[in-house]
């Protein structure tokens, strides 16, 4: 090994990072609350829409105090995750109805793959377990029909929308305590 | 500019102990997991440790497991890798390195012979 | 042995473009968790090329270029210049192992 010698500064660092992740989930929750909109606009939903595949929503206003820095970004990593895989079948298998919504899909699936490439590039700085938990992935079938297809979506967006609510809240207090 | 020194290396004899430490600075050190990677002489890198930024994860590898610790003091900026029971593979140049990594030291060379 | 394969050696001529490739399984590349690159200059300490798969820390020339698809990524070095000739490593987190692993290293020859 040569002389000590320092190394020029990388374009980020964790603080960054986690600057960065708070962003992209603000503009992803932007885009998802528009294509929810676009979706009650042309598919009205009748009530409230749930999939037994969907992660359970991971926080609440009254746990956010007590989060801790590898919990949110694990838990967030794993659900988003999850949302993708859901987000990729709706583009596969949403059927004729959806087809109309495949470029906003598209872009919404790009920004999931962004956010989730720096909640990696994150906790890799951070050293942070990567490993998602053992959960059972649900195989993901056919929509059982055009209607079922419709009401999956609702359930997906209004679901992701929840969690990236509860994540920009998280992210930002997190930011304190790095 | 991001500086990390190590020191601590040497020769030493096989069942042996030595204490390496990484001295970190020009950038927050607290905010960054920090690992060691070695290199046998001629060889590819291994890595060897990490330890979260916080210090609340450790992990080792296979080859480490039982006789290396990883510990760092965030007040101080360094980093420290305790080699117990020191063995002839051991022999290589240890690296400090920092976040993905981003960041490597030089490196200090450590020798197990008898 | 490797838990990333990478070929031990390649070559070019000054302007060519050359591409190192890695590949990993199922716990790291594959898992979705990025892949970064190094090289290491002869008796010196590697240095970060190119980390989450395609991104260039600054300073980092735009010769070089990173992909990678499923279980497999790749370190593409256009222009190929005289002070290429180096050592490059791919890494990448493994989610069984809670920490990175590194390929066996490629030898890039300047001919």
């Known amino acids: 090994p040569g002389p000590p010698a320092g190394s020029p500064r990388v374009s980020s660092d964790p603080r960054a990072d986690l600057d960065s992740a708070v962003l992209l989930t603000r503009s992803l929750l932007a885009d998802t609350r528009q294509l929810a909109a676009q979706m009650r606009d042309k598919f009205p939903a009748d009530g409230d829409h749930s999939l037994d595949s969907l992660p359970t929503l991971a926080m609440s206003a009254g746990t956010l105090g007590s989060l801790q820095l590898p919990g949110v970004l694990t838990r967030l990593r794993v659900d988003l995750m999850s949302y993708l895989r859901h987000v990729q079948w709706l583009r596969r298998a949403g059927g004729p109805s959806l087809k109309t919504l495949e470029p906003e899909l598209g872009a919404l699936q790009a920004r999931l793959e962004r956010l989730l490439r720096r909640l990696q590039l994150l906790m890799s700085r951070l050293a942070l377990p990567q490993a998602a938990p053992d959960q059972p992935v649900i195989p993901l079938g056919p929509p059982a029909s055009a209607w079922g297809s419709i009401r999956a979506a609702h359930a997906i967006l209004g679901g992701l929308h929840l969690t990236l609510d509860w994540a920009v809240r998280g992210l930002l207090l997190l930011k304190t305590r790095l | 500019e991001v500086q990390l020194l190590e020191s601590g290396g040497g020769l030493v004899q096989p069942g042996g102990s030595l204490r390496l430490s990484c001295a970190a600075s020009?950038?927050?050190?607290?905010?960054?997991?920090m690992h060691w990677v070695r290199q046998a002489p001629g060889k590819g890198l291994e890595w060897v440790s990490v330890?979260?930024?916080?210090?609340?994860?450790?992990y080792y590898a296979d080859s480490v497991k039982g006789r290396f610790t990883i510990s760092r003091d965030n007040s101080k900026n360094t980093l420290y890798l305790q080699m117990n029971s020191l063995r002839a593979e051991d022999t290589a140049v240890y690296y400090c390195?920092?976040?993905?990594?981003?960041?490597w030291g030089q490196g200090t060379l450590v020798t197990v012979s008898s | 042995q490797s838990v990333l394969t990478q070929p031990p050696s390649a070559s070019g001529t000054p302007g060519q473009r050359v591409t190192i490739s890695c590949t990993g399984s199922?716990?790291?590349?594959?898992?979705?968790?990025?892949v970064h690159w190094y090289q290491q200059l002869p008796g010196t300490a590697p240095k970060l090329l190119i980390y989450?798969?395609?991104e260039r820390p600054s300073g980092v020339p735009d010769r070089f270029s990173g992909s990678k698809s499923g279980t497999s990524a790749s370190l593409a070095i256009s222009g190929l210049r005289s002070e290429d000739e180096a050592d490059y490593y791919c890494?990448?987190?493994?989610?069984?192992?809670?920490?990175?692993?590194f390929g066996g290293g490629t030898k890039l020859t300047v001919l």
């Open positions: 890494a990448a987190w493994d989610d069984s192992l809670n920490g990175p692993v």
């Open positions: 199922s716990s790291n590349i594959g898992a979705g968790l990025d």
């Open positions: 989450s798969n395609n």
């Open positions: 330890i979260s930024y916080d210090g609340s994860y450790k």
């Open positions: 390195a920092a976040g993905v990594p981003d960041y």
């Open positions: 020009g950038f927050t050190f607290s905010s960054y997991g």
